[in-house]
């Protein structure tokens, strides 16, 4: 028998510093976990104390802090070259900042294979990115060789920028016939990587012949056997075993996401590429284990740049941004016009003919938005006041709803009015009219949304059985701020872009803003 | 462009050692496999081993063991053989040679000649 | 080892004439195997893996196949510039193992 140790991160999202609990910004340094030179210190040890290990990412490295905002991938090419990691698939994010994007920052400076079985490149950019990503790679690992096969959400032209010249396949047939070349290789242990999510994970397990062993990312799974060290729920068992098609145990994973946990997998494979057994947990990278000196001081050595960057001058605004509470939590208030504009903006992808666009909705909770911003100050935003007004580190994320669900939401938005709550919704694509004389649940007497299958978009009546698309913060698809019939109900929900950043870059794009108060939530007569 | 430059011709004693060179560029080093390739005067090709810089893994050909030693220089991009105990059994052209995806040799050096005699 | 046979040590054709190039396997290698071109005093050239895969910028008189064990580089309209040594290599398993080559040469 030969033994693998499989080390795999998915979803880091920039998260090159040490971090909270949560995620969010690191306050009390003794309470903080993750970060590349926390990662780097156990990434070693477990080095040193194995002989067979693989250290793997399942994508979404790019886009999440101002990390990714000012060095826009080169953080994520050194640090992991840092790290020495074995391989990475291409999640959706890293096709954030188009393809040149991905190209110059992270593929020409990898210093290690960059894998997605299932993107196909055409035209004038074939030549251009050729070898520069692969479908797959045969790995030397001690006396044994091991096949790994890289694959990327097919959703990434939806919720990301990766141009016209890049075909996404569907994985699984994209997936057998790159497996079957390792085979041919004879090449017997295999390994799936890739972002494409829990569900697509356990289904490449099922169907995909050859495949020994899954390492996913994108749904931010955690997984885990026994009692969890931190506030992750286990979606299931690590490893999650799924039975293929042809009667082999096949062993999943996935390490929740924001490098808070190194997943860790132990693989016991015979003579003939079978896997014998698995066993593991991902590791909870907390303040027990120290940051190693060497990656912490490069670290911060980068650091310099962005406390730079977020006092500079992202673009100006001639109007007072209203993000006071006492507006946002009770009216349509013109920062949250702001924001939901600019989600929208961030979300154009002009993949079919029929629709201007595929998503035209917005909504956000008013108590996410955390302050307002003058523009007696000449004007000027800096990233320094936008991180005051989203300061959760939150992204801005893509869900399927039913028409019904969202009426739900609407309700729920105003049961309580009155009492400065978050819940109160700010809109984009969306008019709607509420009547604070009916009772809680009923007050909801308009709601019309913003068309997507059409060339001049107008506002139509909600179609409750309808399924829609709606930008929304994590924390309303998390069911935050009491919107569980959204967590409940939704139908998909693929992360998107951090908050300040898509806000940062649209600012940044109109030079001048001048966002107004226009009808976009109404009081009917007599109510308010 | 893929470049695989070899260092120039050996004249060595049999008995003595001699290390070849291979620098390479147009390409991320780490990320792909060098393997080593002797050709004998008018003979046929044979497979020494290979090295992944990446990991600075190693796999000999078992004819090749304790004859050949192949090593790497991730920050000059280079890869090295040393050939130890030479004999006039030894003397032929030695390629280095770069995969595509593993196993075939997309990428050839122009070949070191090494001569053993006394 | 897997043992890689070329019967043919030295092949005669004329321009324009198909020709095909045959390598024997010992054993089982499926469709892993290459054929490369090397010219007296230059270094070989990849031309085909994976039995029928041309690499990048190989005329497309080039092609391979196989058939069991047997193995097959056909040039459809021999030129000029195609006389020369060719190799096949199977990249099945460790240890890779050429062929001991076939010379093409004018008849």
């Known amino acids: 028998a030969w033994e693998l140790t499989i080390l795999h991160t998915n979803d880091v999202h920039s998260r090159l510093e040490q971090t909270s609990e949560d995620s969010s910004k690191c306050v009390n340094a003794s309470r903080c976990m993750g970060g590349v030179a926390r990662l780097f210190t156990k990434v070693q040890q477990i080095r040193r104390a194995e002989p067979n290990v693989l250290l793997l990412d399942a994508g979404d490295q790019y886009q999440g802090t101002i990390w990714f905002t000012v060095y826009k991938g080169a953080e994520v090419a050194h640090f992991m070259n840092a790290l020495r990691y074995d391989a990475m698939a291409l999640g959706n994010h890293e096709f954030d900042n188009g393809v040149e994007g991905l190209i110059e920052p992270l593929l020409k400076e990898a210093k290690f294979p960059i894998l997605s079985a299932n993107i196909k490149a055409k035209g004038p950019l074939a030549s251009q990115i050729s070898g520069l990503y692969l479908p797959y790679k045969v790995l030397p690992v001690g006396d044994e060789v091991v096949g790994i096969v890289g694959y990327t959400s097919k959703e990434t032209p939806f919720l990301s920028n990766p141009g016209t010249n890049l075909v996404f396949e569907d994985e699984i047939t994209a997936l057998q016939p790159e497996v079957d070349k390792l085979k041919t290789l004879n090449v017997n242990k295999i390994i799936a990587l890739g972002h494409s999510g829990f569900e697509m994970d356990k289904l490449i397990a099922q169907k995909v012949r050859g495949v020994d062993v899954v390492v996913g990312g994108h749904s931010n799974t955690f997984l885990y056997t026994g009692n969890p060290p931190s506030k992750e729920v286990p979606a299931g068992k690590y490893p999650f075993i799924v039975t293929s098609d042809d009667g082999r145990k096949v062993p999943v994973v996935q390490a929740y996401a924001f490098g808070k946990y190194l997943g860790y997998l132990k693989i016991e494979f015979d003579e003939r590429g079978n896997v014998i057994s698995s066993h593991g947990n991902p590791i909870l990278l907390n303040s027990s284990i120290p940051e190693d000196p060497s990656i912490k001081a490069d670290i911060n050595k980068w650091r310099i740049k962005l406390d730079n960057y977020s006092t500079q001058e992202l673009g100006k605004t001639i109007v007072y941004l209203d993000g006071s509470s006492q507006s946002c939590r009770f009216r349509e208030c013109n920062m949250g016009n702001l924001i939901c504009d600019a989600m929208i903006n961030n979300n154009l992808r002009h993949t079919d003919e029929m629709f201007w666009n595929h998503v035209s909705m917005c909504i956000l909770n008013g108590g996410g938005i955390r302050s307002p911003i003058d523009e007696r100050n000449n004007g000027t935003i800096t990233w320094e006041n936008l991180a005051a007004v989203l300061p959760f580190g939150g992204t801005f994320d893509l869900v399927q709803l039913k028409g019904s669900t969202l009426k739900k939401a609407f309700e729920h938005s105003v049961h309580r009015y009155g009492q400065s709550t978050g819940e109160f919704l700010q809109v984009g694509g969306i008019h709607v009219v509420y009547d604070l004389s009916r009772k809680p649940g009923d007050r909801v007497v308009k709601l019309d949304v913003l068309c997507t299958k059409c060339r001049v978009p107008s506002y139509d009546p909600l179609k409750m059985d309808e399924v829609y698309k709606v930008i929304l913060p994590n924390f309303l698809a998390n069911g935050g701020d009491g919107f569980q019939m959204i967590k409940d109900e939704l139908l998909r929900h693929d992360s998107g872009d951090q908050d300040i950043n898509v806000v940062s870059t649209y600012i940044s794009k109109m030079k001048v803003i001048y966002p107004a108060v226009e009808g976009r939530i109404k009081f009917s007569t007599g109510s308010h | 462009q893929v470049q695989l430059q070899q260092s120039g011709p050996e004249l060595v004693k049999p008995g003595a050692s001699v290390r070849i060179s291979c620098k390479t560029s147009g390409y991320t080093f780490t990320n792909y496999y060098i393997y080593w390739v002797k050709q004998r005067p008018g003979q046929g090709l044979e497979w020494i081993g290979w090295?992944?810089?990446?990991?600075?893994?190693?796999k000999y050909n078992e004819k090749f063991k304790g004859k050949s030693t192949l090593t790497a220089d991730k920050s000059s991009s280079t890869a090295f053989m040393q050939l130890s105990s030479l004999t006039s059994e030894d003397s032929a052209v030695y390629f280095c040679?770069?995969?595509?995806?593993?196993?075939?040799?997309?990428?050839w050096g122009q070949g070191t000649l090494v001569t053993v005699s006394s | 080892d897997i043992v890689m046979t070329q019967s043919h040590k030295f092949m005669s054709t004329s321009i324009g004439d198909r020709v095909s190039i045959t390598c024997k396997a010992s054993?089982?290698?499926?469709?892993?195997v290459a054929w490369y071109q090397q010219k007296p005093g230059q270094s070989p050239k990849l031309l085909i893996y994976?039995?029928?895969t041309r690499h990048t910028g190989v005329p497309d008189r080039f092609t391979g196949n196989t058939s069991g064990t047997e193995h097959t580089l056909t040039i459809s309209s021999v030129q000029a510039e195609d006389l020369a040594l060719y190799y096949c290599q199977q990249h099945y398993s460790t240890p890779f193992t050429f062929g001991s080559g076939t010379t093409l040469e004018i008849k």
């Open positions: 040679a770069r995969d595509d995806n593993y196993a075939w040799f997309a990428y």
């Open positions: 090295i992944y810089p990446g990991n600075l893994n190693i």
């Open positions: 054993q089982d290698v499926s469709t892993a």
């Open positions: 994976w039995t029928n």
